[in-house]
C-alpha cells in the first residue's frame, strides 16, 4: 500500500497506518483488513461507517488521533477490539448497534464526564471495559447490566465520589478491578457481591472511616490477597497484593482493613443478609468464636490476571496481551466452598489447574480431631504473586500433555512467635500453638495466591480436621491437603453441582460446627 | 490435480526487468492465496511474495518497491513482475499456492530460472 | 524478522534408523488465541520442488506417511522420522507462517550413510 504497512500475523491481514498524518482514512485499504493501526494521526472526526467495506476487522486503534467526535453509523460485524484511548472525547457514543461483536473497548484517557444509563446497550460480548483518566463523578446505576460477560473493568484515575450499590450485579466473570485514584470515601454495602474477585486495586482514594466503611473492611480482610497496588510499567512478576494500601483517608492513613470500628454496630459490616451468605462479624464470648461461615465462590471460568489469562490445562489459551481481543469460552461449572470465617485457606490455589467436572456431587468428610488452641496470623499486607511460568504470552499448547504437578517452595506468610502472635491480645501459651509449618503448593502456571487472612485474636478457638479435604475426586488437579495449620474445624462438604442461578450454598453444604 | 506451471524466466541483465507467470489448474484459483519463492543455485528458500485471495500483496523488505505481484483470477494466473533486477536475485522461482488464508505452501510448481547477469 | 535455525545442517543416516531434526525460531510461534504454533516443514528432494509435509507443528499433510511427525512449542521444534527410507533423502526446511515476512530454515540434508 503507498501510505501504509501492510503485513500478515498468524493468518490476520494487519494493516499499520500509524503515524501518518492522516486527517481521514486512507484510500485502497486492503478489502481484506483484520487488523487495522491508525493510531498518532489527525483525525479529529471519524466515521466508523468508512470502515464498512472491511468486513473481516476484527481490531480497530484510534487511540491518539485528537479525536473529538466518533460518528456510530453502519455495521462492523466482527470487530472485537477498539482502542480509542488518549483522544478528546467528551461523550460516549453509543456503539452497541455499529459494534454488537465488541469484547474490548478502551476509552482511556478521553475527557467523559459522564455516562448515559444506556451508553453500553447492546454490547452484550463486551469483556474488557478500560474508562481509566477521564473526568468521571459519578455512573448510573444500571451501567453494566447489558456487559453481562465483563472480565475486566477499569475506571482508575477518575473523579468518582460513589459507586452504585448495583454496579457490579450479574457480573459473574468479573476478575480485574481497577478503582484507584479516584475520590472515593466509601464503598455501599454489598458492592462487591458474592462471587471472587482476584484482582482489586482501590489504593487513592480518601476512604471515610467511620461505621459506613465497615462492609468494605471486612470485604478487604476477606479479600487481602486479592487487593494489589497498581505501578505503571512495573512486570507482573514484581505485582505484589497489598491490603495496607487501602488507607483510611481521616486517620493518619491507617489501613482500612484494621479500622477497629469502636462504638459501632455489631452487625455494622453484614449489611444485606444475602452479602456473604450471613456471614456476621464474628461474635466472640470469652475464648470462643461463634459458628460463622464464609462462602468462596470459584467464577464460571479460567481466572485471569489484569495482564493476562491464567491459562488452564483444558481451556486454550488466547490473546495475551491486554487489552486482548479474545477470550476463552470454555467454562466450568460454578462452585462453592465453605472455609471458617475471615480466612481463606494457607495454601497456593492454581484456579488453572482445578477443572470442575460436571459429576454428581461428591463429598469429603474429614475426621475431626481434639481442640488445640492456635493463633491465626493477620494476612501479610505484601505478598508477592508467584513467578509464572511459562510466561503468559506463551503457554503450553493444549494440545500437549499438560505437565505433572511439582512442588516449589512455598510462598508463606512470615510465621509469628509462638508466644508472641502479632494480633496482640493475650499470648497463647506455647505448648498448644506450635509454629505454623508452610504450605507446599502445586506448580502449575501462572498462580493465585490464597493463603491465612484472619483477623481472629488469639484466643480464637478451631477445632482441627487430621483428614486431607478434597474438593471433587474427578477434578484433573486436587487442592493440597490442608493438614496444616491453621485448621478447619468441623466439615467441609462440596455439592459441585450448583446450579448457576442459586447464588447461596446448596443445602447439602454442612455448616462449621460450633463450638 | 493441482497444477502450477511457470514461465518467463530467462538471463536478464542489471537493473533489467522480468515478468514471470503461473498459470494454476486443479483448484478454485481465486479462493487462494498465492505466493512466490525463489532459491538461489545451492541455498535455501526465500520467500519472495504473496498476494491474498482478495488481491492484497505483501513483500518483504529485499524486493519491496522492486517487484510486484499480482494476480487475473479470470485467468486463473499469477504474476511476478521484477524490475530493477539484481545479481543476488539470481534463483530459480517457485509459484506456491497457500491454503486457506494461512501461509503455509501446500503446493508447488516446478520452477522458473531467472539468472541477472551481465 | 523471525530467524529459523536448523541443526544438523547435514545427517547421514541408515536406512530402517530413526533422525531427527532440529528447528529453533528466534520468536515464539506460538498464537495464544488458538494454541497452534505456526510451523511448517518440507522436503525437497533432489532435482524436485519443495514438497509440504507438516503445518502447524504437527499436523501431517495428506499422503505423507506416519513415519514422519513434527512437535515442539514456542521456540523450539523438531521433525522426526521414526524409520528412515532410502527416498527419505533430501532436504528438509522447516517454515515459520505466524509471522511476514515469512522465513526458512537453511536447511537439512539427509542422505544415506
Known amino acids: 500500500h503507498p501510505i501504509c504497512e501492510v503485513s500478515k500475523v498468524a493468518s490476520h491481514l494487519e494493516v499499520n497506518c500509524d503515524k501518518r498524518n492522516l486527517t481521514a482514512l486512507p484510500p485502497d485499504l486492503p478489502k481484506d483488513t483484520t487488523i487495522l493501526h491508525l493510531s498518532e494521526n489527525l483525525l479529529y472526526t471519524f466515521s466508523l461507517a468508512t470502515l464498512m467495506p472491511y468486513t473481516r476487522l476484527t481490531q480497530l486503534n484510534l487511540d491518539r488521533c485528537e479525536l473529538t467526535k466518533l460518528q456510530v453509523d453502519g455495521t462492523l460485524p466482527v470487530l472485537g477490539t477498539l482502542d480509542l484511548s488518549h483522544n478528546q472525547l467528551q461523550s460516549l457514543p453509543l456503539l452497541g448497534q455499529t459494534l454488537p461483536a465488541l469484547t474490548v473497548l478502551d476509552v482511556s484517557f478521553n475527557r467523559l464526564t459522564s455516562l448515559p444509563l444506556g451508553a453500553l446497550r447492546g454490547l452484550g460480548e463486551l469483556q474488557e471495559l478500560y474508562l481509566k483518566g477521564n473526568e468521571l463523578k459519578t455512573l448510573p446505576p444500571g451501567l453494566l447490566t447489558p456487559t453481562p460477560k465483563l472480565e475486566k473493568l477499569s475506571l482508575a484515575n477518575n473523579n468518582l465520589t460513589e459507586l452504585p450499590a448495583g454496579l457490579l450485579n450479574g457480573l459473574e466473570n468479573l476478575d480485574t478491578l481497577l478503582l484507584q485514584e479516584n475520590s472515593l470515601y466509601t464503598i455501599p454495602k454489598g458492592f462487591f457481591g458474592s462471587h471472587l474477585l482476584p484482582f482489586a486495586f482501590l489504593h487513592g482514594n480518601p476512604w471515610l472511616c467511620n461505621c459506613e466503611i465497615l462492609y468494605f473492611r471486612r470485604w478487604l480482610q476477606d479479600n487481602a490477597e486479592n487487593v494489589y497496588v497498581w505501578k505503571q510499567g512495573v512486570d507482573v512478576k514484581a505485582m505484589t497484593s497489598n491490603v495496607a494500601s487501602v488507607q483510611c483517608d481521616n486517620s493518619d492513613k491507617f489501613p482500612v482493613y484494621k479500622y477497629p470500628g469502636k462504638g459501632c454496630p455489631t452487625l455494622g459490616d453484614e449489611g444485606d443478609t444475602d452479602l456473604y451468605d450471613y456471614y456476621p462479624e464474628e461474635d466472640t464470648e470469652g475464648d470462643k468464636v461463634r459458628a460463622t461461615r464464609t462462602v468462596v465462590k470459584f467464577p464460571t471460568k479460567a481466572h485471569t490476571t489484569p495482564w493476562g489469562l491464567f491459562y488452564s490445562w483444558s481451556t486454550a489459551s488466547l490473546d495475551s496481551q491486554m487489552p486482548s481481543s479474545l477470550h476463552p469460552t470454555q467454562e466450568s461449572t460454578k462452585e462453592q466452598t465453605t472455609f471458617p470465617p475471615r480466612w481463606t485457606p494457607n495454601f497456593t490455589l492454581h484456579m488453572e489447574s482445578i477443572t470442575f467436572s460436571k459429576t454428581p456431587k461428591s463429598t469429603t468428610e474429614p475426621t475431626p480431631s481434639p481442640t488445640t488452641s492456635e493463633p491465626v496470623p493477620e494476612p501479610a499486607p505484601n505478598m508477592t504473586t508467584l513467578e509464572p511460568t511459562p510466561s503468559p504470552t506463551t503457554p503450553e499448547p493444549t494440545s500437549e500433555p499438560a505437565p505433572s504437578p511439582t512442588t516449589p517452595e512455598p510462598t508463606s506468610e512470615p510465621a509469628p512467635s509462638p508466644t508472641t502472635p502479632e494480633p496482640t491480645s493475650e499470648p497463647a501459651p506455647s505448648p498448644t500453638t506450635p509454629e505454623p509449618t508452610p504450605i507446599p503448593t502445586i506448580a502449575t502456571s501462572p498462580t493465585i495466591l490464597v493463603s491465612a487472612t484472619s483477623l481472629i485474636t488469639p484466643k480464637s478457638t478451631f477445632l482441627t480436621t487430621t483428614k486431607p479435604v478434597s474438593l471433587l475426586e474427578s477434578t484433573k488437579k486436587t487442592i493440597p491437603e490442608l493438614d496444616q495449620p491453621p485448621k478447619l474445624r468441623g466439615v467441609l462438604q462440596g455439592h459441585l453441582e450448583s446450579s448457576r442461578n442459586d447464588p447461596f450454598l446448596h443445602p447439602d453444604f454442612c455448616c462449621l460446627l460450633p463450638l | 490435480e493441482v497444477q502450477l506451471v511457470e514461465s518467463g524466466g530467462g538471463l536478464v541483465q542489471p537493473g533489467g526487468s522480468l515478468r514471470l507467470s503461473c498459470a494454476a489448474s486443479?483448484?478454485?484459483?481465486?479462493?487462494?492465496?498465492m505466493s512466490w519463492v525463489r532459491q538461489a543455485p545451492g541455498k535455501g528458500l526465500e520467500w519472495v511474495s504473496s498476494?491474498?485471495?482478495?488481491?492484497?500483496?505483501y513483500y518483504p523488505d529485499s524486493v519491496l518497491g522492486r517487484f510486484t505481484i499480482s494476480r487475473d483470477n479470470s485467468k486463473n494466473t499469477l504474476y511476478l513482475q521484477m524490475n530493477s533486477l539484481r545479481a543476488e536475485d539470481t534463483a530459480v522461482y517457485y509459484c506456491?499456492?497457500?491454503?486457506?488464508?494461512?501461509?503455509?505452501?501446500?503446493?508447488w510448481g516446478q520452477g522458473t530460472l531467472v539468472t541477472v547477469s551481465s | 524478522d523471525i530467524v529459523m535455525t536448523q541443526s544438523p545442517l547435514s545427517l547421514p543416516v541408515t536406512p530402517g534408523e530413526p533422525a531427527s531434526i532440529s528447528c529453533k525460531s528466534s520468536q515464539s510461534l506460538l498464537n495464544s488465541r488458538n494454541q497452534k504454533n505456526y510451523l511448517a516443514w518440507y522436503l525437497q528432494k533432489p532435482g524436485q520442488s519443495p514438497q509440504l509435509l507438516i503445518y502447524f507443528t504437527s499436523t501431517r499433510e495428506s499422503g505423507v506417511p506416519d513415519r514422519f511427525s513434527g512437535s515442539g512449542s514456542g521456540t523450539d521444534f523438531t521433525l522426526k522420522i521414526s524409520r528412515v527410507e532410502a527416498e527419505d533423502v533430501g532436504v528438509y526446511y522447516c517454515?515459520?507462517?505466524?509471522?511476514?515476512?515469512?522465513?526458512f530454515g537453511q536447511g537439512t540434508k539427509v542422505e544415506i550413510k
Open positions: 486443479g483448484f478454485t484459483f481465486s479462493s487462494f492465496a
Open positions: 517454515q515459520q507462517h505466524y509471522s511476514s515476512p515469512w522465513t
Open positions: 506456491a499456492k497457500s491454503r486457506g488464508y494461512e501461509d503455509y505452501f501446500d503446493y
Open positions: 498476494i491474498t485471495s482478495a488481491g492484497t500483496p
